[in-house]
């Protein structure tokens, strides 16, 4: 239904009444409407609602509403519907981000890496290698590196130190009667128990073998597939390595601080390989990287001399 009411707060626009040749100052129409009839010497302008599929964002003096953008192309979803006041806005569904004109899945940070910056609908996830004292044992686009379980706080000992990819394995100390107490300096073979991981301060046990300088620094040794990473970010999606190569992992050698060769100690060393058997799997996690610059938004912006 056309509306002719003019609000005191509404802006004005200049209109040439071509029939009479007169330059007139007319009241603008509210957002969501358009000028169906310009004002004349004797009448107010007439506003009509934008037809379905069209919109005007602002008060205006235009003769036709703007056409809404095309329906969202798969896999995009509607963030804002096409309505009298708003253009259709498309966005990427959860777990994806805008890359060029479409949506790409958020990068999955591989095992040994955690999320440094969460992904959004317009930005990819940023990954970082797990720092000393933390690990990530699952490929994920949402999980951060988790702190090692603090075995000591649970009156347990570290029987297998954590890596970037695995948590500490804690074990209990066996109870010794006074007659069978071990001689000083001998290592104790604990009963292993895989404890549940907790977000607690890491133990001070330092495994050796993979990275002697374990950090985010570019000097640290990195798996081949991640060799192009700068400042702890995953390489660009366009690189040829997309995670198809093996991630070469060197298993940490458990080193016992006391070097006296007692029977228990020898027993531990013998068992080590079986305890580490799960540590050397290949990682086939595809690695996708950040996109440079902003995604091209669907810019259905209009400018009209009589709008705004």
């Amino acid at each position: 239904q056309p509306e002719q009411k003019a609000s005191n707060l509404i802006g004005t626009y200049r209109h040439v009444d071509r029939a009479t040749g007169q330059v007139l100052t007319c009241d603008k129409c509210p957002a969501g409407t358009y000028v169906s009839e310009h004002c004349t010497n004797t009448s107010l302008r007439v506003c009509s609602s934008c037809p379905v599929g069209t919109f005007t964002r602002h008060e205006n003096g235009i003769e036709k509403c703007h056409d809404c953008s095309q329906p969202c192309p798969w896999p995009m979803i509607e963030k804002l519907p096409c309505a009298a006041l708003t253009d259709r806005e498309c966005t990427c569904p959860p777990g994806m981000f805008q890359s060029n004109a479409t949506c790409a899945p958020h990068t999955v940070c591989p095992v040994g890496w955690g999320v440094r910056k969460k992904g959004t609908e317009t930005e990819d996830v940023r990954c970082k290698q797990c720092a000393r004292g933390t690990f990530s044992d699952v490929p994920s686009s949402v999980m951060k590196c988790k702190a090692y379980t603090d075995c000591l706080s649970q009156n347990l000992v570290v029987i297998k130190p954590g890596t970037k990819e695995t948590d500490n394995v804690c074990g209990t100390l066996p109870s010794f009667s006074s007659s069978t107490s071990p001689s000083p300096g001998t290592a104790i073979f604990p009963r292993p128990e895989h404890m549940e991981t907790h977000e607690v301060p890491s133990s001070t046990y330092v495994p050796k073998g993979m990275n002697s300088t374990e950090s985010n620094s570019s000097a640290s040794v990195r798996p081949k597939v991640l060799s192009s990473i700068q400042e702890g970010t995953v390489p660009d999606n366009t690189s040829s390595a997309r995670g198809k190569e093996d991630v070469n992992k060197t298993l940490p050698n458990l080193q016992v601080v006391n070097h006296q060769q007692g029977p228990h100690h020898r027993h531990i060393l013998k068992l080590l390989p079986s305890m580490e058997a799960t540590g050397g799997e290949k990682s086939s996690t595809p690695i996708k990287g950040p996109k440079r610059g902003h995604p091209r938004q669907n810019l259905h912006k209009h400018f009209d001399i009589n709008e705004h």
Epitope: V16, D17, R18, A19, T20, G21, V23, E37, T40
Partner: antibody, heavy 113, light 107 residues
Framework: QVQLQQSGPEVARPGASVKLSCKAS????????LNWVKQRTGQGLEWIGE????????YYNEKFKGKATLTADNSSSTAYLQFSSLTSEDSAVYFC??????WGQGTLVTVSV | DILMTQSPSSMSVSLGDTVSITCHAS??????IGWLQQKPGKSFKGLIY???TLEDGVPSRFTGSGSGADFSLTISSLESEDFADYYC?????????FGGGTKLEIK
């Protein structure tokens, strides 16, 4: 009341120029657009262009660009149409109009050798 | 350019009759149309503008109608002074363009 008084008939040689005038009265000259229209017998009506004396803004029909020049003198409330390089095709009656409703009486231009 | 097709080009009618002249625009022009009257050897008189608005001093027997692309001028109860040429003009878009005219003659 609104009046548009046009200058008298013109006879010109091919290649020459003519300048027609249209004196406005009865309204504020600088507040309205003025148009010029050509009428040739058996050829219908053709819009030449418009001028807004308020800022001397002009707009021409592509067909008359380079041929017609529109000007205005606010002090005398008079609009002008100059036609250059005249040919027999330019023989016609030329009208000044305010909008499409108020018309001058027309000026006959005859181009002949 | 917008083409204005006017019909009929001429018609013979009697005093007191009602007649309609139509104009079709080659594209939508909303209500940006005017109707003009020209008597032989004379200038033009604006009758109607904005498709339906009657110019001051024009008799009410002249009415305009239509919107978009199809328009008409109706003259009811024709009087002797109404026999003249009639033109439509669109001013929705540059260049303004005119219909070919309709000659109204006494039968």
């Amino acid at each position: 009341q609104v009046q548009l008084q046009q200058s008298g008939p013109e006879v010109a040689r091919p290649g020459a120029s003519v300048k027609l005038s249209c004196k406005a009265s009865g309204y504020t000259f600088t507040d309205y657009y003025l148009n010029w229209v050509k009428q040739r017998t058996g050829q219908g009506l053709e819009w030449i262009g418009e001028i807004y004396p308020g800022n001397n803004h002009t707009y021409y029909n592509e067909k008359f660009k380079g041929k017609a020049t529109l000007t205005a003198d606010n002090s005398s409330s008079t609009a002008y149409l100059q036609f250059s390089s005249l040919t027999s095709e330019d023989s016609a009656v030329y009208f000044c109009t305010r909008g499409v409703i108020k018309w001058g009486q027309g000026t006959l231009v005859t181009v002949s050798v | 350019d917008i083409l204005m097709t006017q019909s009929p080009s001429s018609m013979s009618v009697s005093l007191g009759d009602t007649v309609s002249i139509t104009c079709h625009a080659s594209q939508g022009i909303r209500n940006s149309i005017g109707w003009l009257q020209q008597k032989p050897g004379k200038s033009f008189k604006g009758l109607i503008y904005h498709a339906t608005t009657l110019e001051d001093g024009v008799p009410s027997r002249f009415t305009g109608s239509g919107s978009g692309a199809d328009f008409s001028l109706t003259i009811s109860s024709l009087e002797s002074e109404d026999f003249a040429d009639y033109y439509c003009v669109q001013y929705a878009q540059f260049p303004y363009t005119f219909g070919g005219g309709t000659k109204l003659e006494i039968k």
